[in-house]
Interface confidence: low
């Protein structure tokens, strides 16, 4: 179980690196973030570390409610702060593992 979670964490972070470059990856991560109401791997600040992602920008799928340009110059109160690895991991543990 720990190995699976560790693998998922590594894979999620790797996909984040590909987000700006790969439309298919972007669509998958957007769906995960929107469905699980999460943002980034550990938390939303992970997006700052991605090359070619602006420090003040997250994918729109991180927003609690999609508002005008919510992913650009975002307000911290308007986005999901919880990380996806923990949130999706909890769901996997409960339903799959």
């Amino acid at each position: 179980r720990d190995k699976v979670m560790s693998e998922f964490n590594n894979n999620f972070r790797q996909q984040m690196e590909n987000y700006p470059k790969n439309n298919h990856t972007a669509s998958i991560l957007d769906r995960m973030q929107a469905d699980f109401k999460c943002c980034g791997a550990a938390n939303y600040t992970d997006w700052e570390k991605i090359p070619s992602m602006s420090k003040n920008r997250v994918p729109d799928s991180c927003c609690i409610n999609v508002t005008v340009g919510c992913g650009i110059n975002f307000n911290e109160k308007a986005i999901h702060k919880e990380g996806c690895v923990e949130k999706i991991g909890g769901w996997l543990r409960k339903n799959v593992l």
Epitope: Y19, P20, N23, H24, S27, S54, K55, R57, C70, I72
Partner: antibody, heavy 117, light 108 residues
Framework: QVQLQESGPKVVKPSETLSLTCTVS????????WNWIRQSPGKGLEWIGY??????DYNPSLRSRVTISEDTSKNQFSLRISSVTAADTAVYYC????????????WGQGTMVAVSS | EIVLTQSPGTLSLSPGERATLSCRAS???????LAWYQQKPGQAPRLLIY???SRATGIPDRCSGSGSGTDFTLTISRLEPEDFAVYYC?????????FGQGTKVEIK
């Protein structure tokens, strides 16, 4: 390399609806912000609005008359401006707002639309 | 909305000279969201600078951007024949995204 191409009628009658389509080739429209920008003769540039995976934002000066939508199956996005007047005569550009620059880094060549009876 | 005012309206210079274009915002703009574009007659604008100071792909290092807050500058250190065009600044940090009215750089 992403390429954008605008298409649609070159002349629209006053009070009718202006409809343009932007076809994206060399990339998918399922990412990025896809924008419409216009430039009236002898004037500067005016941002009309964007769509991104179904989310939209419009310039308040045009919001009541504008609709921007996307068709992912055709890799196209469209602009509709209702109740046009001579003031809507302009060159209309579609443009991509990319992740790398977060600015309008790819533009179509533009299409001139005249509002005239 | 944020109003961007560019000056001068027209800049008459000779090839080899330095061009300094100014863009002033009506309220503070996050420098991450300030861009400069070049437009030639009959063509679409081309992105030169984004994030106030980062050059877009393929833009020569004679073009540079600087500034923060409400005052931004585009500098072309040595004008080449292909640099004579209209230049626009644009902010995309606050909706509606807006452009300046443009500065024309013409051959003296």
């Amino acid at each position: 390399q992403v390429q954008l191409q605008e298409s649609g009628p070159k002349v629209v009658k006053p009070s009718e609806t202006l409809s343009l389509t932007c076809t994206v080739s060399g990339g998918s429209i399922s990412s990025y912000y896809w924008n419409w920008i216009r430039q009236s003769p002898g004037k500067g540039l005016e941002w009309i609005g964007y769509t991104k995976r179904g989310y939209t934002d419009y310039n308040p000066s045009l919001r009541s008359r504008v609709t921007i939508s996307e068709d992912t199956s055709k890799n196209q996005f469209s602009l509709r401006i209702s109740s046009v007047t001579a003031a809507d005569t302009a060159v209309y550009y579609c443009a991509q707002m990319g992740w790398g620059s977060h600015a309008f880094d790819m533009w179509g060549q533009g299409t001139m639309v005249a509002v005239s009876s | 909305e944020i109003v961007l005012t560019q000056s001068p309206g027209t800049l008459s210079l000779s090839p080899g000279e330095r061009a300094t274009l100014s863009c002033r915002a009506s309220q503070s703009v996050n420098s991450r969201y300030l861009a400069w574009y070049q437009q030639k007659p009959g063509q679409a604008p081309r992105l030169l600078i984004y994030g106030a100071s980062s050059r877009a792909t393929g833009i020569p290092d004679r073009c540079s951007g600087s500034g923060s807050g409400t005052d931004f500058t585009l500098t072309i250190s040595r004008l080449e024949p292909e640099d004579f065009a209209v230049y626009y600044c644009q902010q995309y940090g606050s909706s509606p995204w807006t452009f300046g009215q443009g500065t024309k750089v013409e051959i003296k």
